[in-house]
């Protein structure tokens, strides 16, 4: 007897962290035998929607016009073969940016720092917040990502990087969000260009060592997993 | 063949409310379409009113202009309505349903032939 | 709110001759723009999706540009059956598909 059917792969474009009002298409792509498509959205009625495969049928098309707060959230899909329905593909985690107002992001002592000396990034919001993101251009994943204690909210989160060394270089930006729903994100603050001189290089940066320099849309999950207390707030990283 | 026909259109007094609807043939929503409804006044342009995505119906979208008055709403898979309230003369106007389609960037691909609304003491 | 500004609001051409009208977003749409053709007691028609894409049936005469605010929409060797108001719009983007005011083209 032949096992289940393999789980299709989900994934969304341009990338799974959309700004408010922006357009996004959900691809689930399964195989060739598969005659319909299921997307489920987690806490919505299920189906969220149903798709005939478009042609060669091994993949189908879900649209979104107009990212909204209702669309952000974790969606999974599923495929119908002349044997039964898939296994659930993994999930896809579509976030909204353009919830809250942005941050305002600043490094201390300068953005302009010597290799082998520290730098605190210091992600502000206006309002009190109590989850805090940095981001790297080009990074796949978050660098950091600072949540508090007991929902406590804050109004800033600090990034440390001691010692810098040349990996730190590079621009970046911060988003604030509430613990109530991680999908919805600030506005990002405006890019903060972090400029490292000097030739030393110390071996093990910390705790940015798993900075991403790979190029790619910033469209992976962003929970990260781990942590250290930092300051009444929880520091994740990958 | 794809088509879609409003119905409903009628003369009313000012302050009275009017319901339209929008019947789909030869296609049901879907994620890939929001329905969305479009007015004129007589020797006027087109005033998009609101759409309503195809599967979402939390997702509905407003102009600003109608403040409230009008609702969209999805009563199936193939009808859309537009509930209208304290109609003025203003409002008189032909109103036309189509559907916005993700194979064209959500323009509007899709019109039916509209019909008249005409709000007069 | 984004609002869609449409020039000139009428416009007069000859036959054989190149009509430019042209749309201006109140903020950046990327390249969610429409254009649509409606004739005297007609409903309107798709012309061109995605500021310059061609709808289905469209004759290459019709031409469109632009992306952000600043759009274009170009009809050359123009025919009497192109008499007609046209009308752009953005489809959908910021939650909008607002529509510009219309350009009246008549010929000559």
């Known amino acids: 007897q032949a096992g289940p059917l393999p789980k299709p792969t989900l994934w969304a474009e341009p990338g799974s962290v959309i700004s408010w009002g922006n357009s996004v298409t959900i691809w689930c792509q399964g195989t060739l035998e598969a005659r319909e498509y299921r997307l489920d959205k987690e806490e919505s009625p299920a189906p969220w929607d149903r798709q005939n495969p478009l042609e060669p049928k091994n993949k189908a098309r879900f649209s979104i016009p107009s990212m909204t707060e209702d669309y952000a959230g974790r969606y999974r899909c599923y495929y119908r073969s002349p044997v039964g329905w898939s296994q659930p593909s993994d999930p896809l985690e579509l976030v909204m940016t353009g919830a809250y107002s942005k941050p305002t992001l600043s490094a201390l002592p300068s953005p302009l720092v010597t290799s082998g000396k520290s730098v605190t990034l210091l992600c502000q919001s206006r309002s009190p917040m109590d989850t805090f993101l940095l981001i790297k251009e080009r990074a796949a994943h978050p660098l950091l990502h600072l949540r508090s204690e007991h929902g406590a909210q804050q109004h800033q989160a600090e990034f440390p990087m001691s010692p810098v060394t040349s990996v730190h270089g590079g621009t970046y930006r911060c988003f604030s969000s509430h613990g109530f729903s991680h999908y919805l994100l600030s506005h990002p603050s405006d890019p903060l260009e972090l400029i490292v001189s000097g030739s030393l290089e110390d071996p093990r940066p910390s705790p940015t060592r798993s900075v991403s320099t790979a190029a790619g849309p910033e469209d992976q999950p962003l929970m990260p997993t781990g942590s250290v207390p930092h300051s009444g707030l929880r520091r994740h990283w990958e | 063949e794809q088509s879609v026909e409003e119905s409903g259109g009628d003369l009313v007094k000012p302050g009275a409310s009017l319901t339209l609807t929008c019947a789909a043939s030869?296609?049901?929503?879907?994620?890939?379409?929001?329905m969305c409804w479009v007015r004129q006044a007589p020797g006027k342009g087109l005033e998009w009113i609101a759409c309503?995505?195809?599967?979402?119906?939390?997702?509905r979208w407003y102009a600003s202009w109608p403040k409230g008055r009008f609702t969209i709403s999805k009563t199936s898979s193939t009808t859309v309505t537009l509930q209208m309230t304290s109609l003025t003369a203003a409002d008189t106007a032909t109103y036309f349903c189509?559907?916005?389609?993700?194979?064209?960037?959500?323009?509007?691909?899709?019109w039916g032939p509209g019909t008249l609304v005409t709000i007069s003491s | 709110e984004l609002v869609m500004t449409q020039t000139p609001a009428s416009v007069e051409a000859v036959v054989g001759g190149t009509v430019t009208i042209k749309c201006q977003a109140s903020?950046?749409?990327?390249?969610?723009l429409a254009w649509y053709q409606q004739k005297p007691g007609q409903r309107p028609k798709l012309l061109i999706y995605?500021?310059?894409t061609l709808a289905s049936g469209v004759p290459s005469r019709f031409s469109g540009s632009g992306s952000g605010t600043e759009f274009t929409l170009t009809v050359s060797d123009l025919e009497c059956a192109d008499v007609a108001a046209y009308y752009c719009?953005?489809?959908?983007?910021?939650?909008?598909?607002?529509f510009g005011g219309g350009t009246e083209v008549v010929v000559k």
């Open positions: 030869g296609f049901s929503f879907s994620s890939t379409y929001c």
């Open positions: 189509a559907r916005s389609d993700t194979d064209y960037e959500w323009g509007l691909s899709l």
């Open positions: 995605k500021a310059s």
């Open positions: 309503i995505h195809g599967v979402s119906t939390n997702n």
């Open positions: 903020e950046s749409i990327g390249s969610r």
């Open positions: 719009q953005c489809a959908g983007q910021s939650s909008t598909w607002a």
